[in-house]
Interface confidence: low
């Protein structure tokens, strides 16, 4: 069962999954100027059995220049065009450390993929929060959110985290102390 909504947004924090439950979908998004190959799947799907889980389908992008259609693109602010890849890199580093039954690890990048990954989470998925660079975590409880089914509807639990002040970012489970980066972390991961 797919979760209806995005995980909660926490000011000055970003979230990510350590591993993805079976049934999770990842959109096959391509960067500007590219699109999915004609026969390509629109998404990757985490599937598996009791012993092994993996991503079905492979995302493939091709140049969208030679097409029999005309595309009109509304100009976007420069900062939106050049999205940071910090988040994706840190996700992949973290994914190497985990192997949970019934879960898939972070899929490897594909050529010309978009810099922002869009996930569609399923009931039972946990995502973890950390404060962005320059903010300190005040924990009142777990800095995580779980997608749960309640009375036939899905909902995300509220993470008990406040980000404040000027200090190093808090860590995701199992993640080493990050090296200082002038870019910091993006504010959120676009997921569903």
């Amino acid at each position: 069962e797919l979760c209806d909504d995005d995980p909660p947004k926490i000011t000055h924090a970003t979230f990510k999954a350590v591993a993805y439950k079976e049934g999770t979908m990842l959109n096959c998004e391509c960067k500007r100027g590219f699109r999915r190959i004609k026969s390509g799947s629109p998404y990757m799907l985490c599937t598996g059995n009791s012993s092994h889980s993996s991503w079905d389908n492979q995302c493939q992008c091709t140049s969208s220049a030679a097409r029999n259609t005309t595309k009109q693109v509304t100009p976007q602010p420069e900062e939106q065009k050049e999205r940071k890849t910090t988040e994706m890199q840190s996700q992949m580093q973290l994914a190497d450390q985990v192997s949970l039954p019934g879960h898939c690890r972070e899929p490897p990048p594909w050529e010309n993929e978009a810099t922002e990954r869009i996930y569609h989470f399923v009931v039972g998925q946990t995502v973890y929060y950390q404060c962005v660079q320059g903010y300190r975590a005040l924990h009142r409880g777990p800095a995580e959110s779980v997608c749960k089914m309640t009375h036939g509807k899905t909902r995300w639990t509220q993470p008990q985290l406040i980000c404040t002040g000027e200090t190093e970012p808090s860590q995701f489970p199992g993640e080493e102390e990050p090296q200082a980066s002038p870019d910091g972390l993006p504010e959120s991961e676009t997921s569903r």
Partner: nanobody, 127 residues
Framework: QVQLQESGGGLVQAGGSLRLSCAAS????????MGWFRQAPGKEREFVAV????????EYTDSVKGRFTISRDNDKNMVYLQMNSLKPEDTAVYYC????????????????????WGQGTQVTVSS
């Protein structure tokens, strides 16, 4: 899930105009790219136009560019296709379609990548 219902088709003379509407039910409507396709008798279903879920982008097949305009109203769960300067070759059944996954930035002209379809509305352009 998204359910789609087209309306606004009819008989019109060449050079005339029609506005097709597509009513969508389902609270996740605004998350899907929406497209219009058409199918003339004895021919395959072909792409006409598509609009992104966030209304940032539109895309048209070359034969309708400058004559057709796709738009959407996410508050009303509606998609529209304004068709001007209609030609006899525009005669077909017009279908409204929603992408197979939400939040996709890739607006495909390939019918197989659309997961939800309406029943279609007939447009006939006489010369």
């Amino acid at each position: 899930q998204v359910q789609l219902q087209e309306s606004g088709g009819g008989l019109v003379q060449a050079g005339g105009s029609l506005r097709l509407s597509c009513a969508a039910s389902g609270r996740t409507f605004s998350s899907y790219a929406m497209g219009w396709f058409r199918q003339a008798p004895g021919k395959e279903r072909e792409f006409v136009a598509v609009i992104s879920w966030n209304v940032d982008n539109t895309e048209y097949t070359d034969s309708v560019k400058g004559r057709f305009t796709i738009s959407r109203d996410n508050d009303k769960n509606m998609v529209y296709l304004q068709m001007n300067s209609l030609k006899p070759e525009d005669t077909a059944v017009y279908y409204c379609a929603a992408d197979s996954i939400p939040l996709s930035s890739d607006m495909s002209p390939t019918a197989t990548e659309y997961g939800y379809w309406g029943q279609g509305t007939q447009v006939t352009v006489s010369s």
